[in-house]
């Protein structure tokens, strides 16, 4: 009786650290999902290394990743999103290391956008609004957002507010007058799906008025 040689026949010489991490983005391009993986050690020689995902796929058993510089990437509609997939680093068709991952637990939302701040003179507050593409999605609709703001001169003194809506009110009395502020926002899955914080939105800059200032959108 015969069988194929495969990953079990690799020599111990290949015991380099091939640990990797991945994140998924669901409905990132219409109905297409994406999966992005990268080695945790930036010095890994990725020549000839391939990534493959198998299991918990629709219509196919396995898919190969495309390599883009130092990251590995798949865009497909074929994620079943039920159960775990087996993601392997391979060389010459042989598996070096594998991880079983439920793609619904490594979701990284898209970054929020259209962040803006409007000062309301009568209310003495600032209305922060932003948008997220996830409002239109079928899967990852419910997010927790992290709004971070700081006085521009306080480089590391960020204040954070967590919220589930896309609108936040900051009271003028809690901010320094006549100061330049930077504000940004990111998102994380908050219902059924699990995963990672999105990238930060582009920062928005606004100046707090003197005690009396005209109403309207703050100049960036």
């Amino acid at each position: 009786e015969s069988g194929y040689a495969q990953n079990g026949d690799l020599e111990d010489a290949e015991l380099d650290d091939y640990s990797f991490s991945c994140y998924s983005q669901l409905e990132v391009n219409g109905s297409q999902h994406s999966l992005t993986c990268a080695f945790e050690d930036p010095d890994v020689n990725t020549t000839n290394l391939e990534f493959e995902i198998c299991g918990a796929l629709v219509e196919v058993k396995c898919l190969s990743f495309r390599k883009l510089q130092e990251i590995y990437f798949i865009e497909t509609k074929k994620f079943l999103l039920i159960g775990k997939s087996n993601i392997c680093v391979k060389v010459g068709g042989k598996s070096l290391t594998c991880k079983k991952i439920d793609l619904t637990t490594i979701v990284k939302p898209e970054a929020p956008f259209d962040l803006s701040v409007i000062y309301r003179e009568g209310a003495n507050d600032f209305v922060v609004t932003f948008n997220t593409s996830h409002l239109q999605k079928k899967y990852v609709k419910v997010l927790m957002h992290d709004v971070a703001y700081r006085q521009e001169k306080d480089e590391n003194k960020w204040m954070h507010v967590n919220l589930s809506s896309t609108k936040l009110t900051l009271l003028q009395r809690n901010l320094q007058p006549e100061a330049m502020y930077e504000i940004k926002v990111r998102s994380i899955p908050d219902h059924y799906f699990k995963g990672f914080w999105s990238e930060w939105s582009p920062s928005y800059y606004f100046r707090t008025p003197e005690i009396n200032n005209s109403p309207g959108e703050m100049d960036p």
Epitope: Q6, G8, G55, K61, C62
Partner: antibody, heavy 122, light 106 residues
Framework: QVQLQQPGAELVMPGASVKLSCKAS????????MHWVKQRPGEGLEWIGE????????NDNQKFKGKATLTVDKSSSTAYMQLSSLTSEDSAVYYC???????????????WGQGTSVTVSS | DIQMTQSPSSLSASLGGKVTITCKAS??????IAWYQHKPGKGPRLLIH???TLQPGIPSRFSGSGSGRDYSFSISNLEPVDIATYYC????????FGAGTKLELK
């Protein structure tokens, strides 16, 4: 060469449990999933489930949930299947079989053990 | 679950002749089918996987074909050592065996 060694026979009492072993040699045990298959006397083959020895992750035939528990001992390159609450319906030959090369969960098996004959009788 | 209907359940053939066994899946299994030879007291032996890929060391007298739901397996130039029970196995989703075909000599 690749070998999967299984005991020839087990006689067990109804209601008891039995733990079947499958000792692998001739290849890297943690690199290939292991299947278990049942064959009742005069009948065909029935897939029970599979286990990845590298992390003990299992995929099971729902029919055998609660009946069969798959485990491995990496230090001895041995796969185990525990069958619980045995009845005459569990009297069968049980095979372990190494999975062919794909890392996909469901794939054919290449090497098979000789099988262990389990007889449930008082 | 995917069901596999294997036929015939038994057949008699002459040495040097050709036999064909068929398996029909309850749904498209996308060529994920394997064929095994099983002799009493032994573990099954893998002959073919992925519809038509012959395992190393298996004679070219054995062949497989098919797609979608319908698959076939043939042995040509039948030899005495071929007397056994043959099973198909689908592994597209979970694993399901056909009921088996017992091959006997005429």
């Amino acid at each position: 060469q690749v070998q999967l060694q299984q005991p020839g026979a087990e006689l067990v009492m109804p209601g008891a449990s039995v733990k079947l072993s499958c000792k692998a040699s001739g290849y890297t045990f943690t690199s290939y999933w292991m299947h278990w298959v049942k064959q009742r006397p005069g009948e065909g083959l029935e897939w029970i489930g599979e286990i990845d020895p590298s992390d003990s992750y299992t995929n099971d035939n729902q029919k055998f949930k609660g009946k069969a528990t798959l485990t491995v001992d990496k230090s001895s390159s041995t796969a185990y299947m525990q069958l619980s609450s045995l009845t005459s319906e569990d009297s069968a030959v049980y095979y372990c079989a190494r999975r062919l090369y794909s890392n996909s969960y469901y794939y054919a098996m290449d090497y098979w053990g000789q099988g262990t004959s389990v007889t449930v009788s008082s | 679950d995917i069901q596999m209907t294997q036929s015939p359940s038994s057949l008699s053939a002459s040495l040097g002749g050709k036999v064909t066994i068929t398996c029909k899946a309850s749904q498209d299994i996308k060529k994920y089918i394997a064929w095994y030879q099983h002799k009493p007291g032994k573990g099954p032996r893998l002959l073919i996987h992925y519809t038509s890929t012959l395992q190393p060391g298996i004679p070219s007298r054995f062949s497989g074909s098919g797609s979608g739901r319908d698959y076939s397996f043939s042995i040509s130039n039948l030899e005495p050592v071929d007397i056994a029970t043959y099973y198909c196995l689908q592994y597209d989703n979970l694993l399901t065996f056909g009921a088996g075909t017992k091959l006997e000599l005429k």
